[in-house]
């Protein structure tokens, strides 16, 4: 990698520049695609900042750009114009360029701020020269609002700095009135005033009447040392408008302002609803509006005019239509500061707001809104509803288009069919069920941001309160006993008062659930169950008989149960039990109750009998450890043989 | 605020239905979440009937579902409750209510 | 469904007595409670919604508390307008039932 370029950039005070490829210039012996050249940002600006133009221009610090960006004149330097005066400012920026497998550079961008420079923006090199407004016929002080050279004193180091002064040297005098300093009349013998007399209020204008024509003085401005010495240093040739008022003039009343709404990369036109103003005294043509800052998100332009950016126009530009904003790919808002004025009264502040608004939204879904059952609700997060567009959108608001089946929406404790994000996110949305005949629902919401709406549904599922076993694998062939180590809604029970019950959904693929009966002179083998309650379970009186998959080879293999958990006051749950079995082994201890085991062990054993479940499984029942973990088939045998 | 406000005959004849509308202003019948009828018979307690929410599904009173049909008219703001097969147990105030807000009522007497 | 039981039936109190009415569910509702004032000839008026949430408007001397299966109505200081009877209505499970009422009389 190589980097060419002057890495030096001059930026005017308080402007924006971007970075150029005369600035900045990476290449790669192996002609790498721009794109793929990157710099990040060691160390940012300290007198600005670095931003992107089609990104966020008043958040996050730029970290990381390219020099595909950079050729294309998307990466900007703004410099913030500090509270204190200076006339020259430096700033540094360090990067890291880097495009593997290339070894990373470092770089450093040098940032010069200057008055010095010629500066299409800001045609006065003086900290301020914003001119004069003044009454037919009347005087008016000219303050250091409105003429301020404290930058060339800036120059100066601070410790000499009071020893100093600026001359000011007026080389054309006002042609319609006279300047007084300390109500002595300046003229061409006593030309000078200082920056000094500016400051402690004693330059005044004095206007001689006779209409109300332009007036004005040239000057010229340099720096003076101690005993009125002329010392080396900054100067500047500039002039200094005064604006004469009617007496009689209403200056114009600016009216409240609409922000205007615009997609990105679209065009607009302007309206009175944006930019107008009550004056009696002028015609719209006479109405003149500059523009003082434009925003990042696009610019100004006259139907009819250039292509380009416009920084002048008129009431009547307005009101015919022709002003439009044209929006680049911005997504951010925006605010035009403006001065207006009638070109008879001082120019009045305005701003004119642009709010980009996305072109579509997006409403994300992460997760269903899981409802625990006992508690029968559930809030609302961003992992169920989060809008996004160009941007995340923290203003969003949704409208509840179908409300849930089996539930409601309430904010607050309320039911409501309408809430924000910021309701969403500070957890104040909840589903409650209602009904509780169900173990799912689904709602649906309009989402609103930024002008634009997007739908979207959001589903919601019941988390069972069930303990579920979860350890190795059973045997096929076998029929253990279903009891409250396996499966287990005790906690449901208690927080309830109520017996859980269940339903059998689905499953074993292998096998079935059956009801053991309760001693050898119980009628009957044992019975299929498709319900049971935990009350069953506790009794012991549930076996699932694992089958053997049909049609191979015996072998490990996976399977399931789905159960629908009920229980009073609360929603229904759908859960799983999965389980894992494989061939009987007589040796391996099981970690579960045993109620019968496959008919071929037996026989091997020397004990034919048949493979229906054993009756009560006598002391193994109340046994904490099941008997077949003891010791294998014999440990079996011994819990088994007098049952 | 929602104001509500119920309107409809005073006097059902036996075994007739009972129908009471309910005029919404102030708010939407699409944006408020429950629109409910409530009864409260004389003297008495009172009596959930059914709701009709903003998306226009109901819910009704199992004691009640087989005789109680409760729809809306979107484009008048307004909500109705008919009641078959009346009998003089059905005798009371009828009010409609968001929960929030409530009508003063109309007394409803099933009387030959 | 769920039942509602208040209790007292009715009380006797003076202006300036503490009042305090309870409401008891028949399986918890999960403080989805709303308490209403009624007088005679009038529709019940909205006191407190979700057990102890004022609804606007009304004085801060009424107060609600509760979870589970009990909940409380208190009147602070009770004022010569707040003679009336008290309902509670769940809003927990459908169909949504109201309390018997609790009258409260000028003693």
């Known amino acids: 990698l190589s980097l060419e370029g002057s890495r030096t950039l001059t930026v005017c005070p308080g402007s924006v520049q971007p970075l150029s490829s005369q600035t900045l210039r990476a290449s790669s012996s192996a002609g790498t695609d721009p794109q793929l050249l990157l710099y990040r940002v060691v160390r940012g600006p300290q007198l600005g900042r670095l931003f992107h133009a089609q990104q966020d221009s008043t958040g996050e610090a730029l970290v990381n750009f390219t020099q595909a960006e950079v050729y294309a004149g998307n990466i900007l330097y703004e410099h913030e114009m500090p509270t204190e005066p200076f006339w020259e400012a430096h700033d540094t920026l360090e990067l890291q360029l880097s495009s593997p497998p290339a070894r990373d550079v470092a770089a450093t961008l040098a940032v010069a701020v200057s008055f010095e420079a010629a500066c299409p923006q800001r045609p006065s090199h003086l900290w301020k020269n914003k001119g004069l407004w003044v009454p037919e016929g009347q005087r008016a002080k000219i303050t250091m609002a409105a003429l301020d050279a404290s930058n060339l004193l800036a120059s100066v180091p601070s410790p000499q700095r009071l020893e100093h002064d600026v001359l000011f040297q007026v080389t054309q005098f006002p042609s319609r009135g006279q300047l007084l300093v300390s109500e002595e009349p300046l003229h061409a013998g006593q030309p000078h005033f200082l920056q000094s007399q500016l400051a402690a209020g004693q330059l005044v204008y004095a206007h001689g009447g006779g209409g109300t024509q332009q007036d004005g003085f040239h000057f010229r401005a340099h720096l003076q040392g101690p005993a009125g010495a002329t010392v080396a240093g900054p100067q500047t040739s500039e002039a200094f408008a005064i604006t004469v008022r009617d007496v009689n003039e209403r200056p114009p009343q600016p009216q409240a302002s609409v922000p205007l709404r615009i997609t990105r990369g679209s065009r607009a036109p302007i309206s009175r609803a944006q930019l107008s103003v009550v004056d009696p005294d002028s015609a719209p043509g006479e109405i003149e509006y500059e523009v003082q800052r434009a925003p990042h998100n696009g610019f100004l332009s006259l139907v009819g005019g250039g292509p380009g950016p416009v920084t002048h126009f008129t009431q009547a530009d307005v009101d015919s239509g022709r002003l439009a904003f044209v929006a680049n790919g911005s997504s951010v808002a925006g605010v035009f500061q403006l001065s207006m004025s009638d070109g008879a009264s001082p120019p009045l502040p305005m701003s004119l707001a642009v709010d980009i608004l996305p072109s579509a939204i997006e409403v994300q879904l992460q997760a269903p809104l899981e409802v625990p059952q006992a508690l029968g609700r559930s809030s609302l997060s961003q992992q169920q509803l989060r809008v996004v567009s160009d941007r995340e959108e923290p203003e969003a608001a949704y409208r509840l288009i179908q409300g849930p089946k089996y539930g409601h929406l309430l904010v607050g404790g309320r039911p409501a069919s309408a809430f924000s994000q910021l309701q969403i996110d500070q957890g104040e949305v909840v589903f409650a069920f209602t009904n509780f005949s169900s173990s799912h629902d689904h709602f649906r919401v309009l989402a609103l941001a930024r002008g634009v709406n997007a739908s979207a549904v959001v589903n919601i599922t019941v988390r069972a309160l069930l303990h579920v076993w979860a350890g190795g694998p059973w045997p096929q062939g076998a029929t253990l006993r279903l009891d409250p180590t396996i499966l287990d809604a005790g906690e449901l029970a208690n927080r309830t008062g109520s017996v859980p019950h269940f339903r059998l959904l689905e499953g074993p693929r292998h096998g079935r659930v059956v009801r053991v009966p309760r001693a050898r002179t119980e009628p009957g083998g044992s019975q299929l169950v498709e319900q049971f309650t935990q009350q069953d379970l506790e009794d012991g009186r549930l076996g699932l008989e694992v089958g053997r998959p049909e049609g191979r080879a015996p072998s490990p293999t996976g399977d399931s149960l789905t159960l629908e958990l009920w229980a009073q006051g609360v929603p229904p749950a759908v859960a799983s039990l999965d389980f894992a079995t494989e061939p009987y082994n007589a040796a391996r201890p099981y970690s579960v109750a045993l109620l019968s085991v496959p008919e071929a062990t037996r026989m091997e054993a020397g004990k034919p009998e048949s493979s229906t479940p054993t009756g009560e499984p006598g002391p193994m029942a109340s046994s904490p450890v099941p008997a077949v973990a003891k010791g294998g088939f014999l440990g079996f045998l011994e819990a088994n043989m007098f049952s | 605020q929602v104001q509500l406000q119920e309107s409809g005959p005073g006097l059902v004849k036996p075994s007739q239905t009972l129908s009471l509308t309910c005029t919404v202003s102030g708010g939407s019948i699409t944006s408020g979440y429950y629109w409910n009828w409530i009864r409260q018979h004389p003297g008495k307690g009172l009596e959930w009937i059914g709701y009709?929410?903003?998306?226009?599904?109901?819910n009704y009173n199992p004691s009640l579902k087989s005789r109680v049909t409760i729809s809306r008219d979107t484009s008048k703001n307004q909500f109705s409750l008919k009641l078959s097969s009346v009998t003089a147990a059905d005798t009371a105030v009828y009010y409609c209510a968001d929960f929030d807000y409530w009508g003063q009522g109309t007394l409803v007497t099933v009387s030959s | 469904d769920i039942q509602m039981t208040q209790s007292p039936s009715s009380l006797s109190a003076s202006v300036g007595d503490r009042v305090t009415i309870t409401c008891r569910a028949s399986q918890g509702i999960r403080n989805y409670l709303n308490w209403y004032q009624q007088k005679p000839g009038k529709a019940p008026k909205l006191l407190i919604y979700y057990t102890s949430s004022l609804h606007s408007g009304v004085p801060s001397r009424f107060s609600g508390s509760g979870s589970g299966t009990d909940y409380t109505l208190t009147i602070s200081s009770l004022q010569p307008e707040d003679f009336a009877t008290y309902y509670c209505?769940?809003?927990?499970?459908?169909?949504?039932?109201f309390g018997q009422g609790t009258k409260v009389e000028i003693k």
């Open positions: 209505q769940q809003y927990s499970a459908l169909p949504w039932t």
């Open positions: 009709i929410t903003f998306d226009g599904s109901n």
